[in-house]
């Protein structure tokens, strides 16, 4: 049986079937408290109106509560990511409460049914918030509802329906089919939770868009642009064209919201930051990497509730795996001038030095053209941290291999038979890292000879009046 | 003590059907899901396909899906599955295995019914 | 499908030695991996749980290491009664698979 969600064109299948005739009574929701870090362990089924269970298990009235719920399935059996997460909220926080809402009946449906029993879940799930809320010490301020996909809503549901206000809800990757665009009471939205967060991380602008491509919390994060994840490519999910490939790629990107929040609770010193901006593309050219005014924040469970935010997207680039945070620069480079070049782009390459460690070579990302006599600003981002920057070696080659840009390259060497050589100048470097709030300038080595051929390198060095430092400090610091 | 206690070996012509029998004891049936695995002589172990018996849901190994069906009667704890086409490919020993809460590890197993078919 | 791979078929030690066998996956399956000892006629007994995890009853000389794709079982000081067949199995993603299986036998 082919895994959640997927492939695309299975869903798309599921969205147009007519709806299935119900010929028993469904079961109802089932709430099991995991007292036990042990998976072999059966916990505890909390009861409607039975407080016996409560202390037996002993629930911590007092402690924090975690409802973790599952979305649609096409499996009877559970995700494997639920023992993940489970486990990763005992290690972090080893006092709480962390219930397993089980809807599977109601989730293994066609896709359409099991979206409209979200809502009846939902109610399920404040209807046992309301009646924990009679019991002396216990606060909606300390329950967090965890939803992924289709469970995100169900999570909404159960903020919209519940008598008060819960804590927090945070949507990992919110079901998109049958969602997007509706009205805010059909789907999570921020009035469901004194914070509602969200990460988005199977968005299309094109297809079937599995998860919601529209922001519905108070922060709204997109890894990667929320679309294609690294190590969740073809290539890195098989290695080959096997029966369900598209379905692991499917569920690796869908999932991947899970274990952004996973690597978020087990790996508290290694934070992924993200940053505020209007959409994609300006992170991409590296041009929202400010932490002023609460632009940035920590993803997962680290991230912080953010003042009269409401739809805040914010992004950032991640690893292929845990632990994921990346180190984030922008880097600003003014061409002065382009010597021969006809109709070439070029494309640049960088290699950061600093005192830990020293980066592989990387590719500016071109969003836009390269402008002459202007600042060009980029994005680029390391695995590891680099610490200080000392230097940075700066190349650059003719157009990326397409054949178009071949064509244009020869055309442009034909009409210029006798090119002495295409160069740029370029003097210096600005930096500013995003994990740090550092800014530095680099400036070319030999302040003589700062033009540069294809191929050949410049090399840079923290100029002299050396840090630039603004009054901006670490997000770490920053943040509230 | 948890026990899964199976159905007793079967001797059966290429192209009839079987239906093999996992009683649980010693837990809340409802409350883990049961897998079958295939073991061919002297090979490898093949995960068929696991049922969650709180209600019937299943899920398959493509490769076994149009040959195994799995089910469960709640009120005597009892796990089914159901082989049918036999060919000579089938013969092997069938376990039932518990899964943990999760489904994803077998912490006990039923002591194997064995499979022949012969012509 | 996710591959299990356990590169030695067969390996064998000295009672006393201490033994390491491994099982790779063909992708990343964090830590969801299970390892088994079967003797012949018998069926599978699960050592370790999620790569790492102890199972009570199973001596302690068992123990799990890995995550990702390398994954290895160690045997410290083997026993008479520790000969036969050990599974590795992955409950990554749909279908789990199993090992080829390693043979450990008496030198």
């Known amino acids: 049986s082919p895994t959640p969600f997927g492939p695309e064109g299975q869903l798309a299948d599921e969205l147009h079937k007519p709806k299935a005739i119900q010929t028993e009574v469904k079961p109802s929701v089932r709430f099991n408290l995991r007292t036990s870090k042990d998976p072999e362990h059966e916990g505890c089924y909390l009861s409607l109106g039975h407080s016996q269970p409560l202390e037996d298990c002993g629930f911590n009235m007092t402690a924090k509560t975690f409802f973790i719920i599952h979305g649609w399935t096409m499996s009877g059996i559970f995700e494997n990511w639920l023992h993940k997460l489970v486990s990763a909220l005992h290690t972090r926080e080893k006092d709480a409460n962390v219930v397993v809402v089980d809807w599977l009946p109601l989730a293994h449906q066609l896709y359409t049914d099991a979206v409209n029993n979200t809502r009846v879940v939902g109610h399920s799930i404040a209807r046992m918030l309301d009646w924990l809320q009679e019991k002396d010490d216990f606060s909606l301020g300390n329950v967090h509802l965890i939803g992924y996909s289709l469970g995100a809503h169900v999570a909404g549901y159960a903020g919209n329906f519940v008598k008060g206000t819960v804590g927090r809800i945070t949507g990992l990757d919110p079901a998109g089919p049958m969602f997007e665009g509706a009205d805010i009471h059909k789907r999570l939205s921020p009035d469901d939770a004194d914070f509602v967060d969200v990460l988005h991380t199977y968005t299309r602008s094109f297809g079937l868009s599995i998860g919601i491509q529209m922001p519905v919390g108070h922060i709204d994060i997109y890894p990667n642009g929320g679309d294609f994840q690294p190590g969740c490519g073809l290539n890195d999910v098989l290695g080959s064209m096997a029966y369900g490939t598209i379905t692991e790629v499917v569920k690796c990107e869908h999932e991947r919201a899970v274990h952004l929040f996973v690597d978020s609770l087990v790996n508290q010193d290694k934070p992924s930051f993200a940053f505020q901006c209007t959409d994609s593309n300006r992170f991409k050219k590296g041009i929202c990497l400010s932490c002023r005014k609460n632009r940035c924040n920590s993803i997962g469970y680290n991230a912080k509730k953010m003042r009269n935010k409401r739809n805040s997207k914010m992004y950032l680039k991640t690893r292929a795996g845990m632990p994921f945070r990346v180190y984030h620069y922008q880097m600003k480079i003014h061409v002065f001038s382009y010597k021969n070049m006809g109709e070439i782009e070029p494309t640049f390459y960088v290699t950061l030095y600093g005192t830990n460690a020293d980066s592989q070579t990387l590719p500016l990302e071109i969003v836009e053209r390269i402008e002459q006599n202007a600042t060009n600003t980029f994005l680029v981002y390391t695995e590891e941290d680099l610490g200080d920057l000392l230097k940075i070696q700066l190349t650059w080659e003719g157009a990326s291999q397409s054949w178009y840009n071949l064509w244009k390259e020869l055309r442009s060497y034909l009409s210029q038979p006798h090119n002495p050589g295409r160069e740029l100048n370029i003097r210096r470097i600005r930096v500013k890292s995003g994990e740090t709030q550092r800014k530095l300038t680099f400036c070319a080595e030999d302040p003589e000879n700062t033009s540069i051929s294809p191929g050949r390198e410049l090399w840079f060095r923290k100029c002299r009046d050396g840090w630039r430092m603004k009054n901006e400090t670490s997000p770490t610091v920053e943040l509230p | 003590e948890v026990q899964l206690q199976q159905s007793g070996p079967e001797l059966l012509k290429p192209g009839a059907s079987v239906k093999i029998s996992c009683k649980a004891s010693?837990?809340?049936?409802?409350?883990?899901?049961m897998h079958w695995v295939k073991q061919s002589h002297g090979k490898s172990l093949e995960w068929i396909g696991g049922i969650n018996p709180y209600y019937g849901g299943t899920t398959y190994n493509e490769k076994f899906k149009d040959k195994a069906t799995l089910t469960v009667d709640k009120s005597s704890s009892t796990a089914y599955m159901e082989l049918r086409s036999l060919t000579s490919e089938d013969s092997a020993v069938y376990y039932c295995?518990?899964?943990?809460?999760?489904?994803?590890?077998?912490?006990?197993w039923g002591q194997g019914t064995t499979l022949t078919v012969s012509s | 499908d996710i591959v299990l791979t356990q590169s030695l078929a067969t390996l064998s030690v000295t009672p006393g030695d201490s033994v390491s066998l491994s099982c790779r996956a063909s992708q990343d399956i964090s830590n969801s991996l299970h390892w088994y000892q079967q003797k012949s006629h018998e069926s599978p007994r699960l050592l370790i749980k999620?790569?790492?995890q102890s199972i009570s009853g199973i001596p302690s000389r068992f123990s799990g290491s890995g995550s990702g794709t390398d994954f290895t079982l160690s045997i410290n000081s083997v026993e008479t009664e520790d000969f036969g067949m050990y599974f590795c199995?992955?409950?990554?993603?749909?279908?789990?698979?199993f090992g080829g299986g390693t043979k450990l036998e008496i030198k």
């Open positions: 199995q992955q409950s990554n993603s749909w279908p789990y698979t």
């Open positions: 010693g837990y809340t049936f409802t409350d883990y899901t």
């Open positions: 999620y790569a790492s």
């Open positions: 295995a518990k899964g943990d809460y999760y489904g994803g590890s077998y912490n006990y």
